[in-house]
Interface confidence: low
């Protein structure tokens, strides 16, 4: 538990006086005195304060720099910061999502297990027996080998994790 303080919750101590903190979305203009209340002013446009505070300046909303692959996920208010996310095909490099990197592609022989999001990279998995992927892709799953039998054909070349089977006509014995 927090150590007890001289003032109540949402108050601060100054000059032996307990003053009210400014509410979220407002900044401190002047401290209270024995005779006057704390004076607060709303944050300007593109500014915010997200806690009960005694800040004399509001914080600037985060700028989602398109040059870093960022876009606005949630517009900031006077009480909340802007939330940035990454453009389609990119994901954040850090906790604060301050820049983005391209999603990883899954190499041939691997398929996408989980498509990337704005905050997590592509998860790849090896194509198991019976499946293949012949492309490098951030979206393609492993595809099942073609079933030659259902086409009344036979396997002429076995499939691998990177290639499909090759089907061909059945050899028919002549009478």
């Amino acid at each position: 538990p927090e150590p007890p303080t001289a003032c109540r919750e949402k108050q601060y101590l100054i000059n032996s006086q307990c003053c009210s903190l400014c509410q979220p979305g407002q900044k401190l203009v002047s401290d209270c005195t024995e005779f006057t209340e704390t004076e607060c002013l709303p944050c300007g446009e593109s500014e915010f304060l997200d806690t009960w505070n005694r800040e004399t300046h509001c914080h600037q909303h985060k700028y989602c720099d398109p040059n870093l692959g960022l876009r606005v996920q949630q517009k900031g208010t006077s009480e909340t910061d802007t939330i940035c996310t990454c453009e389609e095909g990119w994901h954040c490099t850090s906790e604060a999502c301050e820049s983005c990197v391209l999603h990883r592609s899954c190499s041939p022989g691997f398929g996408v297990k989980q498509i990337a999001t704005g905050v997590s990279d592509t998860i790849c998995e090896p194509c198991p027996v019976g499946f293949f992927s012949n492309v490098s892709s951030a979206f393609e799953k492993c595809h099942p080998w073609t079933s030659c039998e259902t086409k009344d054909l036979v396997v002429q070349q076995a499939g691998t994790n990177k290639t499909d089977v090759v089907c061909g006509p059945q050899d028919r014995l002549r009478a």
Epitope: S94, A96, S99, S120, D121
Partner: antibody, heavy 114, light 106 residues
Framework: QVQLVQSGAEVKKPGSSVKVSCKAS????????MHWVRQAPGQGLEWIGY????????KYNQKFKDKATITADESTNTAYMELSSLRSEDTAVYYC???????WGQGTLVTVSS | EIVLTQSPATLSLSPGERATLSCSAS?????MHWYQQKPGQAPRLLIY???KLASGIPARFSGSGSGTDFTLTISSLEPEDFAVYYC?????????FGGGTKVEIK
């Protein structure tokens, strides 16, 4: 409360490998990245890399790409860092730190000496 | 790689004095984070996102700055504040730390 407890000090021969562990408790392990940081004797801090335990995504400082391998075991809430081809220059304290760096392990001293 | 240069390398002050530590980045960063480290201990987060006080950190610590120039201020040094302080950026991979400023007793 959140705790990161690292494995004990290690003394290793040049050329060998070492695996340092970092057991997390007090929070949901898969919700936060785990970073690793190195501090050589009397030196500053160097970021090695991190792992996202929810999907095993790793990101490395290029300097440590061929030196360190970071893994995580969700079943035991433990992150690991293996250092290979050890040299005397790898002698350092290695720290794990939770995403955002508010919580750090106590550090593991790895000494490389013949 | 963004290089963080801290100055001064050593700051000799007395308890009660004000300490001003600087961190200069080789390229612009969105935020700067600050840590305190004492001998034999792990670093401790003091300030995150340039100016936000980490949990449990006394209000005598404050951070400011933007772009490439950032400052950690300790308004009135207490005996327990004598330690090494590091700045740290998470804006660009690889994440980097400054070389540290040692605040020692004069």
């Amino acid at each position: 409360q959140v705790q990161l407890v690292q494995s004990g000090a290690e003394v290793k021969k040049p050329g060998s490998s070492v695996k340092v562990s970092c057991k997390a408790s007090g929070y949901t392990f898969t919700n936060y990245w785990m970073h690793w940081v190195r501090q050589a004797p009397g030196q500053g801090l160097e970021w090695i890399g991190y792992i996202n335990p929810s999907n095993d995504y790793t990101k490395y400082n290029q300097k440590f790409k061929d030196k360190a391998t970071i893994t995580a075991d969700e079943s035991t809430n433990t992150a690991y860092m293996e250092l290979s081809s050890l040299r005397s220059e790898d002698t350092a304290v290695y720290y794990c730190a939770r995403q955002g760096f508010p919580y750090w392990g106590q550090g593991t001293l790895v000494t490389v000496s013949s | 790689e963004i290089v963080l240069t801290q100055s001064p390398a050593t700051l000799s002050l007395s308890p009660g004095e004000r300490a001003t530590l600087s961190c200069s980045a080789s390229s612009s960063v969105s935020y700067m984070h600050w840590y305190q480290q004492k001998p034999g201990q792990a670093p401790r987060l003091l300030i995150y996102d340039t100016s936000k006080l980490a949990s449990g950190i006394p209000a005598r610590f404050s951070g400011s700055g933007s772009g490439t120039d950032f400052t950690l201020t300790i308004s009135s040094l207490e005996p327990e504040d004598f330690a090494v302080y590091y700045c740290h950026q998470l804006s660009s991979d690889p994440f980097t730390f400054g070389g540290g400023t040692k605040v020692e007793i004069k």
